[in-house]
Interface confidence: low
Amino acid sequence: VPRWRQQWSGPGTTKRFPETVLARCVKYTEIHPEMRHVDCQSVWDAFKGAFISKHPCNITEEDYQPLMKLGTQTVPCNKILLWSRIKDLAHQFTQVQRDMFTLEDTLLGYLADDLTWCGEFNTSKINYQSCPDWRKDCSNNPVSVFWKTVSRRFAEAACDVVHVMLNGSRSKIFDKNSTFGSVEVHNLQPEKVQTLEAWVIHGGREDSRDLCQDPTIKELESIISKRNIQFSCKNIYRPDKFLQCVKNPEDSSCTSEI
């Protein structure tokens, strides 16, 4: 008799999830000498232990603590780049500017980037059919809780000047409900972080507006200032040129505004 299975509103676990996590771990530890000590099988076991046999709407940060411990990593705290709704450009940037790091440049972020996963209560099965959607089903699902946990820790670790890349093409350039707006902003440590510098990325080629004056940016500035952290904002009018100038800062065209 086929066992009844909970139907969730979100997509199911990514195909070949265990193999993908393990392969990513091996690749990451090969590329990053400082993480060569990491035992990838133990990492997978800890990852699996966080959600297997647990109700996928009842996951806690505590469930991920063994994984967090194994994935402990030292990133220069003054070289952190946060992002919101503009992941691809943020990642392109850190691929060029190798001394800056997004969360996905760390082991744990790299392992889980773009993946979905969940289990089922009281069975050791991974659910490849469906997983809870954050809005339609529940917020305490395995994926959301994972990103909330690692994002909080990443933000807590930051110091000096922290940069955040924001998408100027969206109606809410700063969204209080994003991971950045709901988790990272509130976990920057004022005793360590001097300034949050926002880079607002423009979408349209002819867009010359000062998006740093956008009401949502003013809202971000207000939240940050109340936390005793300075705020600064820059318009990146030409993201393509911006990346080009990061690659080749000596280029004569890079002295003008990007």
């Epitope: 990593q73 030292t74 705290c77 003054n78 190798r98 807590e156 670790a157």
Partner: antibody, heavy 117, light 113 residues
């Protein structure tokens, strides 16, 4: 055995230039960041500059920013410090040091730079 | 910039006695992600270059005698020499390496009474 040998120190007039070298051996030079640290006569240690293994990361102390340039040639296992616009307060023994877990585990014997007219 | 304050600036201790040097940082050196303190201790004997004794606040560098130990977390750190030997006469420096610019304490001179 790790060895770091500095050279290039000497007497120079204020406003002058000097290039220090640090020859490294006994470890895979290109895999490690390197620091310059200085010590004025009878004073404490002052960190000067850092360069990553593949020169991708470079940092300077505010006191030398814009005047000193750190560089390295991994094919020659050599670290450099180009010092321009030298001032009397730059007089010190300059040490190169190998990076280790972000701090410094091996130091050279130092080379003395004297800035005086 | 972050200031590292060492105390005392000098001390004279009898052979075999315990030596305690403290180092205070104006900013926490504890990195929450890995729970490590970014603090090192160096020894500089007269006429010699500095030598790494302790890193991560309490990890002894290989080859360093076990009479040397480091402790502390956050902003307050201690270097202890459990039983002073003649060869321990030196200046001791703490150093923060949490982020750049790196900063050293002003040094503590240890002599024999």
């Amino acid at each position: 055995e790790v060895q770091l040998v500095e050279s290039g120190g000497g007497l120079v007039q204020p406003g002058g230039s000097l290039r220090l070298s640090c020859a490294a051996s006994g470890f895979t030079f290109s895999s490690f960041g390197m620091h310059w640290v200085r010590q004025a006569p009878g004073k404490g240690l002052e960190w000067v500059a850092y360069i990553g293994g593949d020169s991708n990361i470079i940092y300077y102390a505010d006191t030398v920013k814009g005047r000193f340039t750190i560089s390295r040639d991994n094919s020659k296992n050599t670290l450099y410090l180009q010092m321009n616009s030298l001032r009397a307060e730059d007089t010190a023994v300059y040490y190169c040091a190998k990076s280790h877990d972000y701090t410094m585990d091996y130091w050279g014997q130092g080379t003395l730079v004297t800035v005086s007219s | 910039d972050i200031v590292m304050t060492q105390s005392p600036s000098s001390l004279a201790v009898s052979l075999g006695e315990r030596v305690t040097i403290t180092c205070k940082s104006s900013q926490s050196l504890l990195y929450s992600t890995n729970q490590k303190n970014y603090l090192a201790w160096f020894q500089q004997k007269p006429g010699q270059s500095p030598k790494l004794l302790i890193y991560w606040a309490s990890t002894r560098e290989s080859g360093v005698p076990d009479r040397f130990s480091g402790s502390g977390s956050g902003t307050d750190f201690t270097l202890t020499i459990s039983s002073l030997q003649a060869e321990d006469v030196a200046v001791y420096y703490c150093q923060r390496y949490y982020n750049y610019p790196y900063t050293f304490g002003q040094g503590t001179k240890v002599e024999i009474k």
